[in-house]
């Protein structure tokens, strides 16, 4: 499929000008290659009319130009003094005309309307309001006022001052007669339809002395704004319909076959299942404008979108609308990353978030998508050291591996963590990605004690048992704080006896805290990594208390406190479930790897409807030793 994009149809009138914008992926090669505008012949060729290399056909001499905007990835063809001969099929493209890197454009130039003398032309957008002004003389001040529409050869009464209203205009038309000082009446038509366009005649009086005025009403269907975005990227539709519809329900819909327009999202709470987790409707301003953001763009998202206002929250005849034609460029600069990450309850996930590598200094954010109230995304963690209180000790955002990717680790998973999360930065807003976390059944990999109590001034040793499957991975202990997890020295104690059917490659790695102080209290994580790619983690809360009896503490799994909701195994080991599906590069041997398929079927893990304040549920005070 060609990555070139432009307007499918361009309509104009004889004597006018058009400006046609064509989009291309702004790679270095594309920015500098030839751009052209050619006319398609009946036998399939395409004859160049103008190109970026300076060629201008004699047909276009003095009335056309082509300008390249390499920084935007666009070029613009301007054509003036249009005639009906210019109607036809064209291509805008890159390189050689026959190469296929092009987009088909249909140009339709029509004759200007043949208007009667003294005809007032009203040009109004679909769904808006028009006021047709009708002057009259004093002798007709007391006589009947009327507005007719020319249908074929016959004038059809639309409205008159005796109270008649044509059924096609019921509820959306009125006739106003100005005060005695002004010899003028006006007809106001709201919620204009395409079918309202045409020739009108207003009249004061019915005899030969009546005053008449011709009006030509042109109702414009909005030209779609062209939007060119990358696959897996995001798009923002800014919808400004005017203050007159500030209090009317708003919608965004996508045109399907024919005139149908399927609601994508509206302010009445409707949302299409295909957009679950990847759409947010920003609340409207006082002037009634609003915006809709869609992330994780898919090929099938391409098409025509309309935003509008109607009490039903969907497109109806006479809705004021704005239109966009979205093209999804499959030659995307945004790398693939898992759209679904699975983790076992009690375990952890490590989510990779892509960002524009030119913006390495931007602030990175990770937020929880909430579908209620048209969508919010409350911040959970950022790269500046802020962590939502309910997530202390179990959530960390790491700048690693860097170079266009950051990592978010969430551990102590519960079923309430299932849901959609967004990766954002304060830089390039096109780089917003969505990941769904699913909580699955399974067994843990890492085994650590429950909450541990250390004694001031003594030595504490905390074990972490790694199964043999992690033999080739780097094993670490770190102390969590709101800016990350600071690595600590640890000791390899040899093979672990905590696993059945696991050979000598299993490992017991201990964290030793010498001469414990109050500052040692807090969350500690053990985990695995490979270079800068993080795998599973398990968390332990270490509480510090006053000395009771001398000596050092060597915490075994059996002696550790079993926290609520965690199972104690028959062997005496307490197991914190800790299997997570991570970056496929890390855990290629695992069967269920992060699922990168688009989840358009609506089969997603359920998210508790509790508020975001309740999410998490694993903050420090829950884990103190009593």
């Amino acid at each position: 499929k060609s990555p070139i994009f432009g307007p499918e149809e361009v309509n104009s009138v004889e004597g006018n000008s058009v400006s046609i914008t064509c989009y291309y992926p702004p790679t270095s090669v594309n920015r500098h290659t030839r751009k052209y505008w050619c006319r398609q012949g009946a036998r399939g060729g395409c004859i160049t009319l103008i190109s970026s290399e300076g060629y201008v056909s004699s047909k276009y001499a003095g009335r056309a130009n082509l300008t390249n905007f390499p920084e935007n990835g666009t070029f613009v063809v301007n054509i003036a003094q249009l005639s009906q001969d210019d109607s036809g099929r064209y291509k805008c493209g890159l390189g050689i005309n026959s190469r296929g890197l092009s987009f088909d454009v249909s140009l339709e130039v029509s004759q200007g309307p043949g208007l009667l003398n003294d005809t007032k032309v009203y040009t109004v957008d679909l769904g808006r309001t028009v006021t047709i002004n009708c002057p009259f003389k004093t002798e007709n001040a007391q006589k009947r006022k009327s507005l007719y529409k020319q249908i074929g050869l016959y004038p059809v009464l639309v409205i008159d001052s005796s109270g008649y209203v044509n059924p096609n205009y019921t509820g959306r038309i009125r006739l106003d007669i100005q005060g005695t000082g002004q010899l003028l009446f006006s007809v106001v038509i709201n919620q204009l339809r395409l079918s309202d366009a045409g020739q009108y005649l207003c009249q004061a009086g019915d005899d030969s002395n009546s005053n008449k005025k011709n009006a030509d009403l042109q109702v414009l269907k909005p030209e779609p704004e062209l939007v060119y975005e990358d696959l897996r990227g995001s798009v923002t539709f800014h919808c400004a319909l005017g203050p007159e519809v500030a209090n009317v329900a708003k919608f965004l819909c996508r045109q399907s076959s024919g005139e149908n327009c399927d609601v994508v999202v509206n302010t009445l709470g409707k949302r299409a299942p295909a957009f679950e987790g990847r759409i947010l409707l920003n609340p409207q301003d006082k002037d009634g404008s609003f915006s809709v953001v869609i992330t994780g763009l898919r090929k099938e998202d391409a098409g025509r979108y309309l935003c509008g206002a109607h009490s039903d929250g969907q497109l109806q005849e006479g809705s004021p609308i704005q239109a966009w034609q979205l093209f999804v460029n499959e030659e995307s600069t945004i790398p693939r990353s898992p759209t679904v990450v699975k983790g076992v309850a009690g375990s952890s996930v490590a989510v990779l978030c892509p960002y524009n590598r030119k913006e390495s200094k931007s602030i990175k954010y990770w937020c929880l998508w909430e579908g209620a109230q048209n969508g919010r995304c409350p911040l959970l963690v950022d790269s500046e050291g802020w962590v939502k209180a309910q997530y202390e000790g179990r959530l960390s955002l790491l700048e690693e591996p860097g170079n266009g990717t950051f990592t978010v680790i969430l551990n102590q998973l519960t079923s309430r963590d299932a849901g959609f999360y967004w990766c954002l930065t304060n830089g390039d807003t096109l780089w917003r990605t969505t990941v769904e976390i699913k909580i699955i059944e399974g067994e843990p990999n890492l085994k650590v004690p429950g909450n541990v109590t250390a004694v001031l001034g003594e030595t504490l040793k905390v074990p972490c048992h790694f199964p043999c499957k992690f033999s080739s991975y780097e094993k670490y202990w770190c102390k969590w704080n709101n800016t990350g997890c600071q690595a600590l020295p640890s000791q390899d104690e040899g093979p672990s006896k905590a696993f059945v059917n696991c050979d000598e490659n299993s490992r017991l790695v201990s964290l030793t805290l010498n001469l414990v102080t109050r500052a040692d209290e807090g969350w500690y994580w053990c985990g695995v990594k490979q270079g800068h790619f993080y795998g599973e983690t398990a968390a332990v809360y270490v509480a510090v208390e006053e000395r009771k009896a001398a000596g050092s503490r060597d915490v075994s799994l059996a002696k550790a406190d079993a926290a609520p909701d965690e199972k104690v195994l028959d062997s005496g080991f307490r197991e914190i479930e800790n299997k997570a599906i991570q970056d496929p590069r890390l855990f290629a041997e695992e069967k269920a790897v992060a699922d990168t398929r688009d989840q358009a079927d609506g089969s997603r893990a359920s998210v508790d409807s509790g508020s975001s304040e309740e999410q998490g549920g694993s903050s420090r005070h829950h884990h103190h030793h009593h």
Epitope: L280, N282, P283, V293, Y365, C367, R376, C377, P378, L379, D382, E384, G385, W386, V387, K388, A389, L424, N426, T429, N482, T483
Partner: nanobody, 131 residues
Amino acid sequence: QVQLVESGGGLVQAGDSLRLSCAASGRTSSLYNMGWFRQAPGQEREFVAAIHWGGGRTYYADSVKGRFTISRDNAKNTVYLQMNSLEPGDTANYYCAARRAPELLDDYKQKPEEIGAYHYWGQGTQVTVSS
């Protein structure tokens, strides 16, 4: 809701120092940025300094860089503004402001220097610098 109470204002000579405090109470777990703004009579309210509540990154208006220092004590839910080398042009009402963590996409675009980014405001404390 978050309530903010400023203190520490007063009348000083040019070149002197002053330390303003702002104590936050209420739902302080939602705090994201805290900042100081000032408003001289007949002037617009202007940004002075801000601090990120998590990592402590600081932001300053060019006019106070090198003279003013913003700091925080998370345990006390308090933010401070240490003002050194005060000038008569620093005379104004000083307001403490708090911003909660972003929730809507537009929130993420707002900068700590923007007055519109802040959700909660104190009553202000007067600082007068005489020459």
